[in-house]
């Protein structure tokens, strides 16, 4: 049977260094808030990821932007309330030498 | 100032357990091929990720499908050649109890 094979150029294009949605734990971005719980406990952020086709290069952000999100903060013994938290997103990515 | 704040329901929807593109090292899926190099060295696969709104639940695949991709295999001292590699993708995800 003729299985649909993703051609090389498409595989390459989708694997190459770019900003991709990643789910990041809120407390990893706000370690000072570790004693509180947030809902959701993770947020979707754009992060540079992918391969560069050269072991001496890695995928890094060359432009970032802030995004502010509304989350529920769960304070012990109190009703949850909305808070605004600001996160850094990766806007533009490039393959740069590892030694930089 | 009326800064664009991502509202809670949208934050929740984007963070909740779902299949999301992730860049995965080829050799992590094909450890027996560790002595060879592939180009690209990583591939974009759908993987279940996200949070479940409950510490007793985690995001798991409940349906998977195979995808076959064309990559370049670099054999030492030989010209690279195309190979077809099959990977497992996550199609449908659900929040399930951790103990399962």
């Amino acid at each position: 049977s003729e299985v649909e094979v993703v051609p090389f150029q498409e595989v390459w294009g989708r694997s190459y260094c770019r900003a991709l949605e990643r789910l990041v734990d809120v407390v990893s971005e706000y370690p000072s808030e570790v004693e509180h719980m947030f809902s959701p406990s993770c947020v979707s952020l754009l992060r540079c990821t992918g391969c560069c086709g050269d072991e001496n290069l890695h995928c890094v952000p060359v432009e970032t932007a802030n995004v502010t999100m509304q989350l529920l903060k769960i304070r012990s013994g109190d009703r949850p309330s909305y808070v605004e938290l600001t996160f850094s997103q990766h806007v533009r990515c490039e393959c740069r030498p590892l030694r930089e | 100032s009326e800064v664009e704040v991502v509202p809670f329901q949208e934050v929740w929807g984007r963070s909740y357990c779902r299949a999301l593109e992730r860049l995965v090292d080829v050799v992590s899926e094909y450890p027996s091929e560790v002595e060879h190099m592939f180009s690209p060295s990583c591939v974009s696969l759908l993987r279940c990720t996200g949070c479940c709104g409950d510490e007793n639940l985690h995001c798991v695949p409940v349906e998977t499908a195979n995808v076959t991709m064309q990559l370049l295999k670099i054999r030492s001292g030989d010209r690279p050649s195309y190979v077809e590699l099959t990977f497992s993708q996550h199609v449908r995800c659900e929040c399930r109890p951790l103990r399962e």
Epitope: S81, V83, E84 | V5, G53, C95
Partner: antibody
């Protein structure tokens, strides 16, 4: 204890502007949203907008864009709402309210009367 | 915009009677992942500011008498007062916070 103390009643002429204040005490002002709500005589409650004192970010009900302007002074833990180009339709009681998504602490209300 | 329809607009009952009022939303207020509906009930007594009674559709606010019960999910919600007291004379509003905030038009409770 947590309190929201609003400024006193206002009698203003059509076309004028008014600024209502809401002084918060008993909690960390920058941690909670302040919302403003309108209660018109014989009618129900209407949400005007919110301000997040931690950032100064605001969000308005479309109906009140251009009518209401929300500001804060974090040094005095006070929220303000300015209403402009007043008409008789703006005659109402205005409440400041702490928190979202559920409104837990309300000010005592400020009565605004627009009359020539 | 989400529209909340409250019924009845007013009712009069004797002390000790059971009262039920309803709130219907034009769209679901349920966050299915959280398994919570973004609906609250408020009580406004004459000459006073509104007071939070119920949130998440069924969670009683601290200090609220247990004769007040909220129920429902999605689009249909109910506030029940199991045995009305004279001090329950008030207007009761439902409010959604799924998308921004809107209030129902209120149910005025009178005591015979």
């Amino acid at each position: 204890q947590i309190q929201l103390q609003q400024s006193g009643p206002e009698l203003v002429k059509p076309g004028a502007s008014v600024k209502i204040s809401c002084k918060a005490s008993g909690y960390t002002f920058t941690d909670y949203y302040i919302n403003w709500v309108k209660l018109k005589p014989g009618q129900g409650l209407e949400w005007i907008g919110w301000i997040y004192p931690g950032s100064g970010n605001t969000k308005y009900n479309e109906k009140f864009k251009g009518k209401a302007t929300l500001t804060i002074d974090t040094s005095s833990s006070t929220a303000y709402m300015q209403l402009s180009s007043l008409t008789s339709e703006d005659t109402a009681v205005y409440f400041c309210v702490r928190d979202s998504p559920f409104f837990d602490y309300w000010g005592q209300g400020t009565t605004l009367t627009v009359s020539s | 915009d989400i529209v909340l329809s409250q019924s009845p607009s007013s009712l009069a009952v004797s002390a000790g009677e059971k009262v039920t009022m309803r709130c219907k939303s034009s769209q679901s207020l349920l966050n299915s992942g959280m398994r919570k509906s973004f609906l609250a009930w408020y009580q406004q007594k004459p000459g006073q500011s509104p007071k939070l009674l119920i949130y998440w559709a069924s969670t009683r606010e601290s200090g609220v008498p247990d004769r007040f019960t909220g129920s429902g999910s999605g689009t249909d919600f109910t506030l029940t007062i199991s045995s009305v007291q004279a001090e329950d004379l008030a207007v009761y509003y439902c409010k959604q916070s799924y998308h921004l905030f809107t209030f129902g038009s209120g149910t005025k409770l009178e005591i015979k």
